[in-house]
Amino acid sequence: IAPSRPWALMEQYEVVLPWRLPGPRVRRALPSHLGLHPERVSYVLGATGHNFTLHLRKNRDLLGSGYTETYTAANGSEVTEQPRGQDHCFYQGHVEGYPDSAASLSTCAGLRGFFQVGSDLHLIEPLDEGGEGGRHAVYQAEHLLQTAGTCGVSDDSLGSLLGPRTAAVFRPRPGDSLPSRETRYVELYVVVDNAEFQMLGSEAAVRHRVLEVVNHVDKLYQKLNFRVVLVGLEIWNSQDRFHVSPDPSVTLENLLTWQARQRTRRHLHDNVQLITGVDFTGTTVGFARVSAMCSHSSGAVNQDHSKNPVGVACTMAHEMGHNLGMDHDENVQGCRCQERFEAGRCIMAGSIGSSFPRMFSDCSQAYLESFLERPQSVCLANAPDLSHLVGGPVCGNLFVERGEQCDCGPPEDCRNRCCNSTTCQLAEGAQCAHGTCCQECKVKPAGELCRPKKDMCDLEEFCDGRHPECPEDAFQENGTPCSGGYCYNGACPTLAQQCQAFWGPGGQAAEESCFSYDILPGCKASRYRADMCGVLQCKGGQQPLGRAICIVDVCHALTTEDGTAYEPVPEGTRCGPEKVCWKGRCQDLHVYRSSNCSAQCHNHGVCNHKQECHCHAGWAPPHCAKLLTEVHAASGSLP
């Protein structure tokens, strides 16, 4: 993996002497062996007839807040520790003047990693011990002497997991771009087996390689609005904890069984990836459970098959792609990989060939978006707590973080006289700096409207005279009639609306007869059902990408990949006059409310969706019996 003469494994390479651009302050120019790796750094590399300027920034989100390392101590006991002082030397960035460029490098001992310009992926690594200014090899991945690797996830297994092959015809999105959505986070736990440890020789070398790999994987996923955060590393420096077989399917099974046993005492993570030094049978370098992300089977096994860590990073990105519901590109009709060269493949190609892929295809992106629509994917939505991100809070970034009272942006841009922009504390005499109920640094009087009613299932909110923020959004009491249904937690759910959400504008509720039976695994109709609160049955529209369906006559139901579960009619959907679906049955509206809720509000408020009094302007919760001004006067306190 890391032989003493690295260039012996390259066909063609160019020798370059990187030049570090001087930073604005002396501290940035300190040598990296002092342990002060700067926040940002830039290098000029003369390669392939160009001068490339790489602008790099430390990957502050590489390690999760509670990052741990587990290994075996000299006395044979297992040790888990949280390393202190998480300064590191792993960077990401771009190449100046190239809009779609990317770079992911470590600067720990010279420069090692990749930078991408257009469709060209350049790999860089040191040729000697000369550090960042010493001789480096820059080469293209296809000039790395290695055998092609394939993914062990077979088309047969994908077929049963992703539904019938016809369901995988790819329809490009209008505008050909990813839908806008929040960033998703994979909290990753990496296990390194004993064969890999022996190959690399020390815990420090393993740690360095794993951080390099995860840094690269994170960079590849950033284009999909994903971040990959390492929350734990386990190094089997003494012996393997389960049998690592040359058969990748056996190894994956063993990994998942072992993980299930360990979950209670190890990190809560979204995904586990094994990196092994064992040579898998044939050309297989990776194997994964499809669409298993966020479940107990969320994991994959990866052979460290290439001298350059970008190799196993591409494998891990590919196997994680399977965990996220992606199929192999070649299995999908009309799938587009926007690589320039015919040989260029995208990350979800079944075989990596001789060059490392650097992007996801259009169909991989579509599979991913489809996976994210499932409730199962909820584990990816939790961003690591801002206050725990390595690097901590930043005063001047418009976000009020730990220890701050306000944040109005950088000092030269701040126009908020209520906030001291250099300290992010309230200005002298200010009660507040942000919020709808904050005006000229003072909290607005009670009873001022701060959030108007937006539809028939909403309620308006008023300032309470004490807080600068508008009170939490509240909705009409569940069961209040709305267009075609009954309000439920601020929505007005109907069968038609649900079918449109899944099947697009042409989707509509199927005939009533479709709801009259339940479906068993394997698409079999079963016992008679007396209501419309079982499986969601639709007709028309376009089948959602990446979802298997069960068709009986004109009734279309969506299933999970393995066909064992079906999309249910959601809670709160109208199933008849004065009736709603509740706990899987069509029940009377009374299930929503206690009959005397609004009576508790003393005629100065109404009951909301939480069965609490929502008071009219100027009246005080919890029962709207007193005016807010009376309550404040009695407590004698203002904000």
Epitope: R60, Q222, L386, L389, V394, G396, N397
Partner: nanobody
Framework: EVQLVESGGGLVQAGGSLRLSCATS????????MAWHRQAPGNQRELVAA???????NYADSVKGRFTISRDNGKNTVYLQMNSLRPEDTAVYYC??????????????WGQGTQVTVSS
């Protein structure tokens, strides 16, 4: 120097939608936060929405539930989807990128602005 270019502004009727885009010359992943601000004639510039590097978002109360800020790291672009537009949303909308610098205060980079006019 970082360049930010806004687009997508225009004239729209009340209740309509617009989507503003802000393309950056560098990688948006290198900014700690990206934001949209607006300035109506005779008024101070105000923050509309911001998105942190972690994906967390921040909205002015007046636009909550109507506007959505998002970003596409692959395209180095930040978006502001504006639905249910009201005449009071009429303003010049500015894109803002916040760069964090070790040992110094953060620095804001600004675009030239794009005009949004909502007619009643």
């Amino acid at each position: 120097e970082v360049q930010l270019v806004e687009s997508g502004g225009g004239l729209v009727q009340a209740g309509g939608s617009l989507r503003l885009s802000c393309a950056t010359s560098g990688s948006i992943a290198s900014f700690n936060a990206m934001a949209w601000h607006r300035q109506a004639p005779g008024n101070q510039r105000e923050l509309v929405a911001a998105i942190h590097i972690s994906g967390n978002t921040n909205y002015a109360d007046s636009v909550k539930g109507r506007f959505t800020i998002s970003r596409d790291n692959g395209k180095n672009t930040v978006y502001l989807q504006m639905n249910s537009l009201r005449p009071e949303d009429t303003a010049v909308y500015y894109c803002n990128a916040i760069e964090v610098r070790t040992g110094l205060s953060p620095r804001g980079h600004w675009g030239q602005g794009t005009q949004v006019t909502v007619s009643s």
